[in-house]
């Protein structure tokens, strides 16, 4: 029999006494074959978190500062449900830490020195800690001890708790620095006030601070928020213009054997019987021996992390470098204005080679940084282990959720001025063998399919999204007989058709020798029915393009395309006759690095671009014979987006509600988990 | 199709010296960049050193200032050059070419440095 015993660990008598009153009133609700509560008390949360990764406890709730801790080796504990605060309509997990300063004052956030700053309290989290922790390396040094490094950073500040004897800079504007509320400058309000009084030119607080403080519209648009790209917004803008999105309160568990299903099915039947409003005789959610005993009082209840988040993703790169840099204290040697080499996300072994070239030829410009499937990247990107890579539009729509922006965008076609003119997109296309004269859009069912990947533009989520709105479910993986698209679950009989060997069968990467357009296509070609590609394909493949075995004798003749109107027509009619327009693949990066992938780029495509003519005894950016390592190799040049530079505005208002309605049939464990930090 | 011998490991002690060789043969005509590669046990393999047909060269922040690459087209005939030799620069060494824009599966044998004392 499993054990289905939680032990869950507390820090004082008084926790250890509300969580023995826990385990014994889930004992009267649940089931004898449920799970069940076990107490543990330590010392501390270190204590604590150290007892977690030691097996001899399995469970504790924790702020953001020590999720941080929780997650470093030797401890590797993972978030696993979250508190949540408001309404159940519209739980809050999240808080924003925000600079807020007067309309009219003019500065931005890379000119805060010299400034005066206001801050709820030293060694708080949105007051002190993000923001002193992401200005870190702009302090003067020494910037040991911190307090003066910040003390000689802004001109003046009011910073409660800090030693106004040996700091008194940090205390000039509130005199004193009283570490109580009888210090009218001390906390989230305090801090505000210290702004709106003038006392202050920059407050650190959390979004909500200034609609607590002014109920008045016109009153909140005299004040904005400090973006760290700088440039400002509006205070309601908090979601795109913030320090760091900090989780309020958090069950941690082991990464590996954590039981965070069991602690989840414990969370979620503790909520139902002593959540909000449930039970008189216990409330999961009060203290009546003290103040946030094992969870925060003023929680509403529990919401279950999406298992792919890890605490690097669930505290996001903002908060984690802005931790990192006080607890480390290290700042890179390089002068800030100088651009460090873009670390590029290369998939799988060929990508890699690949990358590794170009690195070379680019004298360390680019670095290179594997992963092993595109979503496995883009987390990487996330939190800071690489910076860029050129997606498919089905990607860029989820590295957009996951905050990531558009900075350089494929084009396909020949121009004078390629590099300024973004395009409009290529088509997705049905391809067919011309011998199955009897196929047509209208009788796909039972027949077998090619796909480039789950989750891409023409192999997926056009054709799909489609097929969607004709089937109204999601399992395509009965509507086809079998079928490559190369992602699926393993078991899928979307993987039946593919060629990749062992545990490379089906990978959404060019180990999975049907992986891609060209891959697609190949399915096509030897066991296929139909193949969903991009209009380019055939052409590209056929007529000796592609030295290949299976490719060198094809004819493009030998080849029709499906009409969405029951038609048939040669390849050459890919323009009148296609399923959708897809927007061209794009370079997609975090904000923080947008300037400088976009100037390293465009350096690197006009020394190994389309202007290089022989690519056998040069490196050539956009070749890969057929395999589209790393661009698509019929890549002209990279072209500037101008105002197209978000997920939503690239892709398109049409093509973002197709993948939106599609997210029903999502199996994109990264999605599920990048709504969750932005629903 | 490119074919590359590597040639010159061996056992050193911490602080030695050691010079790899890759000699290519085949249609070297197309070699543009060439790049030795090393793969400790139960390690990625990772790129140590590359050098462009130009004497372009790029090396891993590990091994810089310690590690030289060279070529000498003349004999197609790439050098790793390893002085200051570390316990953690043991490992198998590769060469290789980035001629086949197919970005091959194929290595060498490799050659095996064992940095010990």
């Known amino acids: 029999v499993p054990d289905k015993t939680v032990r869950w660990c507390a820090v004082s008598e008084h926790e250890a006494t509300k969580c023995q009153s826990f385990r014994d009133h889930m004992k009267s609700v649940i089931p004898s074959d449920g799970p069940s509560v076990a107490c543990v008390k330590k010392a501390s949360y270190l204590d604590c978190i150290r007892a977690i990764a030691a097996n001899e406890a399995d469970a504790v709730t924790l702020d953001a500062g020590l999720v941080y801790d929780a997650y470093l080796a030797p401890n590797n504990l993972k978030p696993v449900v979250a508190e949540f605060y408001g309404s159940k309509e519209d739980p809050q997990t999240f808080y924003y830490a925000v600079a807020v300063v007067k309309k009219d004052s003019g500065f931005q956030m890379n000119q805060l020195r010299g400034k005066k700053s206001c801050h709820t309290g030293l060694g708080r989290s949105a007051g002190w800690n993000i923001p002193i922790g992401l200005l870190y390396c702009d302090l003067p040094e020494p910037r040991k001890p911190l307090e003066k490094a910040v003390a000689n950073f802004f001109s003046g500040s009011c910073a409660p708790c800090a030693d106004g004897t040996d700091f008194p800079q940090l205390c000039q504007l509130c005199p004193g620095c009283g570490c109580s509320t009888l210090n009218q400058y001390f906390g989230y309000s305090g801090a505000f006030k210290c702004l709106k009084d003038g006392a202050g030119d920059v407050a650190f607080v959390k979004h909500s601070t200034i609609f607590e403080n002014l109920a008045n519209k016109a009153d909140r648009d005299q004040y904005e928020l400090l973006c760290l790209d700088n440039t400002r917004k509006p205070v309601d803008e908090y979601k795109d213009c913030h320090l760091a999105q900090v989780p309020s309160h958090t069950v941690v568990a082991r990464s590996m054997g954590g039981k965070e299903d069991l602690i989840w099915e414990l969370l979620n039947q503790a909520q139902e019987h002593f959540g909000k409003d449930k039970s008189k005789e216990f409330q999961l959610f009060s203290s009546p021996h003290g103040k946030d005993l094992l969870f925060k009082d003023s929680a509403h209840g529990f919401l279950k992390v999406p298992p792919r988040m890890d605490a690097k993703m669930y505290l996001g790169y903002e908060y984690v470098t802005a931790i990192r840099n006080l607890r480390e204290g290290t700042c890179p040697e390089a002068p800030t204005d100088e651009c460090k080499p873009v670390k590029w996300c290369a998939l799988s072994h060929h990508e890699r080679l690949k990358c590794d070239e170009w690195s070379v030829n680019s004298v360390g410009k680019i670095e290179c940084v594997s992963a092993e499937t595109t979503e496995d990247c883009i987390a990487k990107i996330m939190n800071g282990e690489a910076d860029a890579m050129s997606l498919d539009g089905g990607f860029v729509y989820i590295a957009g959720k996951c905050g990531l922006v558009p900075v350089l965008a494929e084009n396909y076609n020949k121009s004078d001025n390629c590099e300024d003119t973004p395009e409009a997109g290529y088509f997705a296309i049905a391809v067919v063998k011309k011998s199955a004269s009897d196929l047509t859009w209208d009788n796909l069912k039972g027949k077998k399919s090619c796909h480039t990947a789950v989750g891409r533009t023409a192999g997926w989520n056009i054709p799909m999204g489609l097929l969607y709105n004709k089937i109204n479910h999601c399992r395509f993986d009965e509507f086809f007989s079998e079928g490559c698209a190369p992602g699926s679950k393993k078991d899928s009989s979307l993987c039946k058709l593919c060629m990749g060997s062992g545990l490379n069968l089906c990978e959404p990467n060019n180990k999975e020798g049907y992986y891609g357009y060209t891959g697609a296509f190949r399915c096509l070609v030897e066991k296929g029915d139909v193949a969903f590609v991009k209009h380019q394909t055939v052409p590209q493949n056929t007529g000796g393009k592609n030295p290949d075995p299976w490719a060198k004798n094809l004819n493009e003749k030998d080849y029709e395309l499906l009409c969405l109107d029951g038609t048939r027509k040669p390849v050459e009619e890919y323009a009148n006759c296609h399923l959708a327009r897809a927007p061209n693949h794009a370079v997609v990066t975090r904000k923080d690095k947008e300037a400088c992938v976009h100037k390293i780029l465009r350096q690197q495509q006009h020394l190994f671009g389309s202007n290089v003519t022989d690519c056998s005894g040069n490196f050539c950016l956009f070749r890969s014979e057929t395999k589209d390592l790393l661009f698509r190799d019929d890549t002209v040049c990279l072209a500037k987006l101008h105002d197209r530079n978000t997920y939503e505005k690239y892709l398109g208002e049409e093509y973002v509600k197709a993948v939106g309605n599609l997210r029903k049939c999502s199996t994109s464990s990264l999605l599920e988990a990048c709504t969750f930090r932005r629903p | 199709q490119v074919q590359l011998v590597e040639s010159g490991g061996g056992l050193v002690q911490p602080g030695g010296s050691l010079r790899l060789s890759c000699a290519a043969s085949?249609?070297?005509?197309?070699?543009?960049?060439m790049g030795w590669y090393r793969q400790a046990p139960g390690k990625q393999r990772e790129l140590v050193a590359g050098?462009?047909?130009?004497?372009?060269?790029n090396y891993a922040n590990s091994v810089k200032g310690r590690f030289t690459i060279s070529r000498d087209n003349a004999k197609n005939t790439v050098y790793l050059q390893m002085n200051s030799l570390k316990p953690e620069d043991t490992a198998v060494y590769y060469c290789?070419?980035?001629?086949?824009?197919?970005?091959?599966?194929?290595w060498g044998q490799g050659t095996q440095v064992t940095v010990s004392s």
């Open positions: 085949g249609s070297i005509f197309s070699i543009n960049t």
């Open positions: 050098i462009t047909r130009g004497g372009t060269t």
């Open positions: 290789t070419d980035y001629s086949s824009r197919y970005y091959h599966d194929y």
